[in-house]
């Protein structure tokens, strides 16, 4: 079966700047600002566009070792980014793959909202509960906060 999970996280950073840093330059920036979460991101195949395969190595603070992700879509105009987790110990015994769609929208009072829509594809008849899907939400929020911390102190970057 397929289990859906949705997350919305606000940020004080405008949408365009957050997309540029968190998504487009995230492979470089995130290991620098959240080293205990993610140590490195390497392109195994491709140059960042759709079809690119990325190998992500988790840091000492994570219970997982690595994950492989496939980039499905990057839309620089609408600030959306879709990717699929296709391999790694995060999938465990129950999951075949996880599809994530990120969208960054302008917030009414300024800043932006990071929206993540995830589809957890279970193997066979396995059930995936909300608790098991919460890890992805917590990781996304942690990484967003780390990027936001950096951007607030470096106002000239990613404009």
């Amino acid at each position: 079966g397929v289990f859906n999970y949705e997350v919305e996280t606000p940020s004080v950073i405008p949408a365009a700047r957050l997309f540029k840093s968190y998504v487009l330059d995230g492979d470089k920036l995130i290991p620098k600002v959240a080293p205990q979460a993610i140590t490195s991101v390497e392109n195994v195949e491709g140059n960042g566009g759709p079809g690119t395969i990325k190998n992500i190595t988790f840091g000492e603070g994570s219970r997982y070792k690595y994950v492989k992700e496939r980039v499905d879509e990057v839309d620089n105009t609408n600030f959306t980014y879709s990717y699929t987790v296709i391999e790694g110990d995060v999938l465990g015994d129950k999951l075949e793959k996880v599809c994530h769609e990120l969208k960054i929208v302008a917030a009414p009072g300024g800043g932006s909202i990071l929206k993540i829509s995830s589809k957890f594809h279970a193997k066979g008849d396995h059930e995936i509960n909300a608790e098991e899907m919460k890890g992805a939400k917590e990781m996304a929020e942690k990484l967003l906060r780390a990027v936001e911390t950096y951007l607030l102190a470096h106002s000239a970057e990613y404009n």
Epitope: A34, P35, R145, Y150, L152, A153
Partner: antibody
Framework: EVQLVQSGAEVKKPGDSLKISCKGS????????IGWVRQMPGKGLELMGI????????KYRPSFLGQVTISADKSIATAFLQWSRLTASDTAIYYC????????????WGQGTLVTVSS | DIQMTQSPSSLSASVGDRVTITCRAS??????LNWYQQKPGKAPKLLIY???NLQSGVPSRFSGSGSGTDFTLTISSLQPEDFAIYYC??????FGEGTKVEIK
Amino acid sequence: EVQLVQSGAEVKKPGDSLKISCKGSGYSFSNFWIGWVRQMPGKGLELMGIVYPGDSDTKYRPSFLGQVTISADKSIATAFLQWSRLTASDTAIYYCARLGATYAGADFWGQGTLVTVSS
Amino acid sequence: DIQMTQSPSSLSASVGDRVTITCRASQTIVTYLNWYQQKPGKAPKLLIYAASNLQSGVPSRFSGSGSGTDFTLTISSLQPEDFAIYYCQQSYAAFGEGTKVEIK
């Protein structure tokens, strides 16, 4: 155990050049920013800039841009702070600090290097 | 650049007193604020990170609060070893001017 060990005190003349160092151990040096902090006699703390040893990415605070050079050599787990021409106003204690993984608080500090510039 | 303003610049207190130090940012820094303690001749020590999180090994009498632009460091019951200078800092950026906590 995480440690940052700085080079020893220096006495220099105005116009001299100087390079001081900060050697890290007990953690993955390449993966954490190192900051340099100035404390002039009887004054507060001032962040001068930061360096990411993994790729030597360097960010200077505005008032120190062009005044000093910050660098790092990950192969020897060492960060550096250097001056091409010292002035008397550079007299201070200089600290290096590791910016921690959680929201970049400076969680480990070197012992400080006293730089005295006098004719 | 965001400026950090600390107050008071100094205060006198007695052992056992509750002490409060404030820090104001010139624009929002969310909760990305750290507090440090520095004793004479020593390197600073991280007490609180991300506004309210106690750094490992720091006594629980220290606490931090606030978000946006206004932040507070509180020492619930001042101990003899707490007489020092305290600094706030925006993560990756500027420090406040410092608050000297002296014996009354």
